[in-house]
């Protein structure tokens, strides 16, 4: 996970400000007002491995 | 380093009453969804409680064989998460952990209590 | 309720092996951009270890040998190859819906 001004956070994740770590966007799904989630709209989801 | 610890069990009659209490320490327990699990030899692992947010005012959910009978509570201020048991029945005997979510996946545990109901 | 079911109820693997271990939801858990099936691993006397997230997102710290795959209804968890720590109970979860629930749970142990 990383710091805000360093690297970015994963593919499928987004920096969360209340939390200080990268959050998975797919708990967007249950907590859409999450800070992160913002992020995660612009940000293409982590592709499926079938 | 996130931690969870765990007090409460032992063992009780049935019809009696147990309070269940988990103490949180190293992650932001304000913004994580508190559950309870239970583990026995028949049921498994069994979600029964689980309590979100102020921001909502605190709303809960409980398993169906534990609803009426369970209640989940917890005080921020406190970083603690409680299971107030009442009416307690054979089948409710188990191992009984604490586990936070944020929102799917229960990333971590307490180290568990056993709670025994028998006469 | 998603009833999680779980296959094998145990399985017994070499060491260096490959460990496949089935979990099939009653009902899809999946939408168009990720699957909501998380795994576990549970040793003796300790609680559950959370392994991997979303179907596929390893845990930091979790070994590359621990891989999963699905989508829907079926998923796979994979160890490969297998070590001796590996010997434990592995559990799917999910969290689609109210209430999260847990397969029955499959014991890996080392031949």
């Known amino acids: 996970e990383q710091a805000p001004g360093t690297a970015p956070c994963s593919r499928g994740s987004s920096w969360s400000a209340d939390l200080d770590k990268c959050m998975d966007c797919a708990s967007c799904r249950a907590r859409p007002k999450s800070d992160f989630c913002l992020g995660c709209a612009a940000a293409p989801p982590a592709p499926f491995r079938l | 380093e996130v931690k969870l610890q765990q007090s409460g069990g032992g063992l009780v009659q049935p019809g009696g009453s147990m309070k269940l209490s988990c103490v949180a320490s190293g992650f932001t327990f304000s913004y994580y969804w508190m559950n309870w699990v239970r583990q026995s030899p028949e049921q498994g692992l069994e979600w029964i409680a689980e309590i979100r947010l102020q921001s909502n005012d605190y709303p809960t959910h409980y398993a169906e064989s534990v609803k009426g009978r369970f209640t989940i509570s917890r005080d921020d201020s406190k970083n603690s998460v409680y299971l107030q048991m009442n009416n307690l029945r054979p089948e409710d005997t188990g191992i009984y952990y604490c586990?936070?979510?944020?929102?799917?996946?229960?990333?971590?545990w307490g180290q568990g209590t056993t709670l025994t109901v028998s006469s | 309720d998603t009833v999680l079911t779980q296959s094998p109820a145990s399985l017994v693997v070499s060491l260096g092996q490959r460990a496949t271990i089935s979990c099939r939801a009653s009902q899809s858990v999946s939408t168009s951009d990720y699957s909501y099936i998380h795994w576990y691993q549970q040793k003796p006397g300790q609680p559950p270890k959370f392994l991997i997230k979303y179907a596929s997102n390893r845990d930091s710290g979790v070994p590359a040998r621990f891989s999963g795959s699905g989508s829907g209804t079926d998923f796979t968890l994979n160890i490969h190859p297998v070590e001796e720590d590996d010997t434990a109970i592995y559990y799917c979860?999910?969290?689609?819906?109210?209430?999260?629930?847990f397969g029955a749970g499959t014991k890996l142990e080392l031949q």
């Open positions: 586990a936070c979510r944020y929102a799917d996946y229960f990333d971590h």
């Open positions: 979860q999910h969290s689609w819906e109210i209430p999260p629930t």
